[in-house]
């Protein structure tokens, strides 16, 4: 998963209390025993923010060594820093763990920019603010890395929550979540509520702030409003989905829907931006520029490089359009749409201007590897990764940042024909397609 634009998080953010909150609606779906309800111990167990990823506290080894681990639905390895590194406050010390087992095998993971490599082993792992279980899981002990760890990010490893097909060195290395489900009674699903700050945070605010929730084994009512809408997982490798239509302020981009999924569309908590295939990105930016044409912003802003700053509290959200992605529904010829606000796709950046200013980066960018629904999308929604039923659910997040005029939305059903044609079939070659 593109590490150059993936991950990287410099601060930890404000969660549910931030921004305006939507009232809870009462039209609940029927209960599914063991799958829904309250998971108080797991609520608010994430910290971080969209710019550098979201992390959960985990323990590894015996006696337990506590580490902060980045939650990444775009990869499938559990990998932790296991040697001193200038950007790590702490690291996994295998020699101190009586339960560590060496697999006598190395692993090397290159990214577009940067890489990590390490040694494979297994050890006992638990999540203090998660299910009350301990599992023996595969761990990649990172011994060497380049442009992987981030100075000041406060995480020391990565929890790849996707499927075995994209695990390194190969699909025989069982991912953490598979081990968890096999060894315990935890249901085969998890859900994520990532809470974007909506405004810059300084370093002291960051350290004390909450970032969201990872509910392991269930769905928590309190984290969303309205109904959950589900889209099929097309193939179990990344969390691949199919986008069937894209609208900017209600205006259809009118592209062949295959373009939206070229060469795939994935839901990836380890990517900051909404990343779009080149043609789609160009059309979307053209449409966003047209919608906000009373202002002109520098070219570098649309490239995600320059920051635009407004006097604190005066950001003109209203001039920026909403963006709707229509996803394939569970029923034939039925789709639903998820709509995000500029409060999601303009990412606040701290420490650059004066305290009199709010500065933002444009967090939609171009991709050569398909659509990536990163934190920019996920921060608007409560996202359910229902692996048991091979589907992903979206509902409006109770912590999404909005204003008094517009909110993020999940709406349906819509009639959409020939949705299967929107999927792109990646040509199979002998070589790995995973040079991410």
């Amino acid at each position: 998963t593109q590490h150059g634009i993936r991950l990287p998080l410099r601060s930890g953010l404000g969660g549910a209390p931030l921004g305006l909150r939507l009232p809870r609606e009462t039209d609940e779906e029927p209960e599914e025993p063991g799958r829904r309800g309250s998971f108080v111990e797991m609520v608010d167990n994430l910290r971080g923010k969209s710019g550098q990823g979201y992390y959960v506290e985990m323990t590894v080894g015996s006696p337990p060594q506590t580490l902060n681990i980045l939650v990444d639905t775009g990869s499938s390895n559990f990998a932790v820093g296991a040697a001193p590194h200038p950007f790590l406050h702490r690291y996994y010390q295998r020699q101190l763990s009586s339960t560590y087992r060496d697999l006598r095998k190395g692993v090397y993971v290159p990214y577009t920019q940067g890489k990590w490599e390490g040694e494979l082993g297994t050890d006992l792992v638990s999540i203090p603010h998660g299910p009350n279980v301990t599992v023996r899981a595969n761990i990649a002990a990172i011994t060497e890395s380049d442009k992987f760890f981030i100075n000041g990010s406060n995480w020391e490893g990565i929890l790849g929550l996707a499927y075995a097909e994209i695990a390194r060195p190969d699909d025989s290395l069982e991912p953490f979540f598979d081990s968890l489900v096999k060894q315990t009674h935890v249901p085969n699903l998890f859900s994520l509520q990532l809470c974007g700050a909506g405004f810059p945070l300084n370093q002291s605010e960051v350290l004390a702030s909450v970032g969201g929730s990872m509910i392991i084994g269930g769905i928590d009512h309190s984290l969303y409003t309205g109904s959950l809408w589900y889209t099929p997982i097309r193939r179990e490798w990344y969390y691949e989905v199919i986008i069937v239509r894209v609208e900017i302020n209600g205006q259809d981009l009118k592209m062949d829907c295959k373009e939206y999924n070229y060469d795939k569309s994935i839901v990836d908590s380890g990517t900051t931006n909404l990343r779009l295939p080149k043609k789609v990105f160009e059309a979307a930016v053209k449409s966003i520029k047209a919608a906000s044409s009373t202002e002109k912003f520098p070219d570098g802003f649309w490239l995600g490089e320059q920051l635009v700053c407004w006097q604190a509290g005066t950001t003109p959200w209203n001039i920026f359009p909403v963006i709707s992605l229509y996803l394939m529904g569970e029923v034939t010829n039925q789709s639903f749409r998820i709509t995000i606000l500029p409060q999601q796709y303009l990412r606040p950046v701290e420490d650059v201007a004066t305290s009199q200013d709010d500065c933002y980066k444009f967090a939609i960018s171009q991709s050569s590897t398909g659509t990536v629904m990163g934190a920019v999308i996920m921060e608007g929604f409560y996202v359910v990764f229902d692996r048991a039923r091979k589907r992903i659910g979206f509902a409006v997040s109770a912590c999404h940042v909005h204003d008094e005029f517009r909110t993020a939305a999940v709406e349906g059903p819509f009639v959409t024909l020939d949705m299967e044609d929107c999927g792109y079939n990646i040509p199979q070659t002998d070589e790995s397609t995973l040079m991410t």
Epitope: S293, T294, E295, K296, F297, P298, D299, G300, F301, E305, Q306, L307, V308, C309, D351, V352, A353, D357, C359
Partner: antibody, heavy 120, light 108 residues
Framework: QLQLQESGPGLVKPSETLSLTCTVS??????????WGWIRQPPGKGLEWIGM???????WYNPSLRSRVTISVDTSKNQFSLKLSSVTAADTAVYYC????????????WGRGTLVTVSS | EIVLTQSPATLSLSPGERATLSCRAS??????LAWYQQKPGQAPRLLIY???KRATGIPARFSGSGSGTDFTLTISSLEPEDFAVYYC??????????FGGGTKVEIK
Amino acid sequence: QLQLQESGPGLVKPSETLSLTCTVSGGSISSSSYYWGWIRQPPGKGLEWIGMIYYSGSTWYNPSLRSRVTISVDTSKNQFSLKLSSVTAADTAVYYCARVGHGVSYFDLWGRGTLVTVSS
Amino acid sequence: EIVLTQSPATLSLSPGERATLSCRASQSVSSYLAWYQQKPGQAPRLLIYDASKRATGIPARFSGSGSGTDFTLTISSLEPEDFAVYYCQQVYTWPPRTFGGGTKVEIK
């Protein structure tokens, strides 16, 4: 070729409003590729950005001057103007108008400048 | 707020010599930095933008380099008309309002 020319009184009394106009010749102020800005330079000192305007009327101001500055555009006359209220001796400077080009980021064309002295 | 610090404040050189001017940002501004030249009694003139691109009509003896926080303007061989004050400006944060304090290049 495009040229910019500042005009306005060279002497303004304290507490009054400084008013300057920049006339654009050799091109249209209504181009969607540019902002039009004001920068000033007190005698013997460095450059200070005052603010800028788009042909649509959208304005951006320096926070330190925001409460006193108004920039406006008159597309029919191919002009944009600066008003700075409640002036003091500290506002004495050479005032430049400029075009903001190269992806609306850099001042790629400047007027010659006009010295405005604030004195009673 | 991003602060630009130029050094040296004054550079005394002879025609034909190489001039190296520095501009340091208090935090990264990527490559969004410009250099301007201002001669006495004249308006500034854009020399370099995006850290290393020469503006229209600027002679090849002027070159810019750097990215992040450290930038350099180099005049390979000083001509008599190059003695002036040089300002850097960052536009990483927009609108474009931050200038450095200037470096005066004077005849030795």
